[in-house]
């Protein structure tokens, strides 16, 4: 075959190499980008920075190589439309350093940055941390800063990301009530910050004020939707960025649903309960409290992460005709209480012969310390049982 | 098939301390209580406690608070009685026992002997 | 805590015969009494649950009834096999209790 005269000639089935002498000052209109998986770029010293808009339509990009060039600066959001980008072989060009953000977001097996004159400065203090963790094969690589030595012999005790304290309320907060939060933002070098409200949606009206190093976040007219719900402010400097959640208890009475009884690998009587603070719960069985054992116990689900909402069951095992009859459950916080009741049967009493007959059962109207604790599993971690003794 | 399999008992010296396994298998674990008996000749079934492998939570008898603890690996399924100070009267077969419906499932047991 | 008492201590019994087993309760247990049936060297089974409901493969020979303090385990035709210790016990309320069983022989 032919030389390929071109600045960049085609490499296997998905690769570009672009090595004729300084044949490139950019990357725009690379032949073939949208297919590409590698691009390799050597000689190239007017190609001096790396953009957002250089790499755009190379999305399938996993290897690039841009060596022996006279790359200055590659901008944070550079590989923005290379997601895909696995290796990143940036030796001898004349990059001074490269920001933490470059490289956020994307997988990176290995990232190559020798023969750069690199400055020793808070801004590689994450690069010294993959060094130091062995990340990308960077250790293997021995970077130096230009003048100053190895990197990792870098000062960095002063190389923080920002520190930040958002301010809550303490007091209580009702339903329709307007909330200030304050983030207070200290650290070198802030550039900057804000914050993330994804998961309000219609839980307030919400209103921005101030900027760096203090900024206030108005929440109006909030709706009890808002518990549970991350108000998340950050900031970012040049060593990285940090954030801070919050979430906003907003104060409304307890609820309670019941449902028929079911029969699953136990029996159970389905709940719903809602309210903050979480309200505390009591079974009655006819009418009286209904001691809970090992053999008749509340069991909540899995809580989802964002609601207040409880769901459980009142499990019990392989009931019979003595457990047939009126549970009620009470629901109760200090903003209110409620109850919900259903009629149960679960078996035929084997010594009644008259159907019209009320089952003689009664129950103590003692009430036992036998329910303290809540049962709730949390999955993916070790749970702290309760203990108690009864006698 | 549901089985409850106890081992660790022995001869032990008072103030000596043990711990005794429960190794559960043919169920699903954490769906149940599981509790402790004691039984000394003349004197029938005492309840120990039980506890719940899903939550951790746990029941003790007053007459033995303090004296045992109950604890649980629910990876393999195994649940544990210790002792760290034992008595002569500690002196027993122990079994433990799934509570389904009733107790509808129990270990062969295991003997402690506590004696100088 | 709930006194569970089982009477008589000792029954000495021909094959064929019936026999009925007590357990008084101190107070109310609203129908939560098993029963359980322990060998000579043996763990105990259960055989009654919720004071009347038979366990798995369990023989229809034994039936158990009663509510509130009074119950009763009857075997109505006993067997060699039957030769065991039985044990009522409550599980209405913390802390679970068991009678002191009734040791049950075959002449």
């Known amino acids: 075959a032919a030389p390929c005269p071109d600045a960049c000639c085609p490499h296997g089935s998905s690769g570009l190499r672009c090595t004729r002498d300084g044949a490139l000052d950019s990357l725009h209109h690379l032949p073939g980008a949208e297919n590409l998986t590698e691009l390799y770029i050597e000689n190239q010293q007017h190609l001096q920075h790396l953009e957002l808009r250089d790499l755009r339509g190379l999305g399938e990009l996993r290897n690039l190589t841009i060596v022996k060039s006279g790359l200055r600066f590659v901008a944070p959001d550079a590989f923005h439309f290379t997601p895909r980008l696995s290796r990143l072989n940036l030796s001898f060009n004349a990059l001074e350093s490269l920001s933490w953000k470059t490289v956020q977001g994307l997988s990176l097996q290995e990232l190559v940055l020798s023969g750069n004159p690199l400055h020793c400065s808070c801004a590689l203090r994450w690069l010294q941390r993959w060094e130091e963790e062995g990340l990308g094969g960077v250790p293997e690589q021995k970077l130096q800063c230009h003048g100053q030595g190895p990197l990792a012999h870098m000062p960095n005790a002063s190389c923080g990301v920002p520190t930040l304290k958002v301010q809550v309320p303490n007091a209580s907060v009702d339903v329709g009530d307007d909330v200030l939060l304050r983030c207070q933002v200290e650290g070198r070098g802030l550039e900057q910050a804000g914050w993330i409200l994804t998961e309000l949606e219609q839980s307030a009206t919400v209103m921005k004020s101030g900027g760096l190093p203090s900024l206030g976040l108005t929440l109006a007219n909030v709706t009890s939707d808002l518990n549970r719900k991350n108000v998340t402010c950050w900031a970012e400097n040049d060593v990285g960025r940090a954030e801070v959640s919050v979430q906003v208890n907003v104060s409304f009475p307890a609820s309670v649903q019941l449902h028929t009884a079911v029969e699953m690998h136990h029996w159970c009587i389905p709940f719903s309960v809602d309210g903050q603070p979480a309200p505390s719960l009591r079974w009655l069985f006819n009418g009286s409290v209904l001691n809970e054992t090992s053999f008749i116990f509340t069991e909540f689900l899995e809580p989802a992460a964002n609601e207040t909402v409880r769901h459980g069951c009142l499990r019990l095992n392989q009931p019979t005709h003595v457990n047939n009859g009126n549970y009620t459950l009470l629901a109760a916080n200090p903003f209110g209480q409620a109850s919900a009741s259903i009629m149960a049967a679960f078996m035929d009493n084997p010594f009644e012969f008259n159907p019209e007959d009320p089952i003689p059962v009664s129950f103590s109207p003692v009430d036992t310390n036998s329910t303290s604790g809540d049962p709730v599993e949390k999955k993916d971690e070790t749970p702290f049982g309760v203990s108690v003794a009864v006698g | 098939e549901v089985q409850l399999l106890e081992s660790g008992g022995g001869l032990v010296q008072p103030g000596g301390s043990l711990k005794l396994s429960c190794k559960a298998s043919?169920?699903?674990?954490?769906?149940?209580?599981l509790g402790w008996m004691k039984q000394r000749p003349g004197h029938g079934l005492e309840w120990i406690g039980d506890?719940?492998?899903?939550?951790?939570?746990?029941f003790y008898n007053e007459n033995f608070k303090g004296q045992v603890t109950m604890s649980v690996d629910k990876s393999i399924t195994t649940a544990y009685l210790q002792w760290n100070s034992l008595k002569a009267s500690d002196t027993a077969m122990y079994y433990c026992a799934r509570a389904g419906t009733g107790f509808d499932y129990w270990g062969q047991g295991t003997t402690l002997t506590v004696s100088s | 805590e709930i006194v569970m008492t089982q009477s008589p201590a000792t029954l000495s019994l021909s094959v064929g015969e019936r026999v009925t087993l007590s357990c008084k309760a101190s107070e109310n247990v609203g129908g939560y009494v098993s029963w359980y049936q322990q060998k000579p060297d043996q763990s105990p089974k259960l055989l009654i649950y919720?004071?009347?409901s038979r366990a798995t493969g369990v023989p229809d020979r034994f039936t158990g009834s009663g509510s509130e303090t009074d119950f009763t385990l009857t075997i109505s035709s006993v067997q060699a096999e039957d030769l065991a210790a039985y044990h009522c016990g409550q599980n209405y309320i913390y802390p679970f209790t068991f009678g002191g069983g009734t040791k049950l022989e075959i002449k």
């Open positions: 919720g004071a009347s």
């Open positions: 043919g169920y699903a674990f954490t769906n149940y209580w």
């Open positions: 506890f719940y492998p899903r939550t951790g939570n746990t």
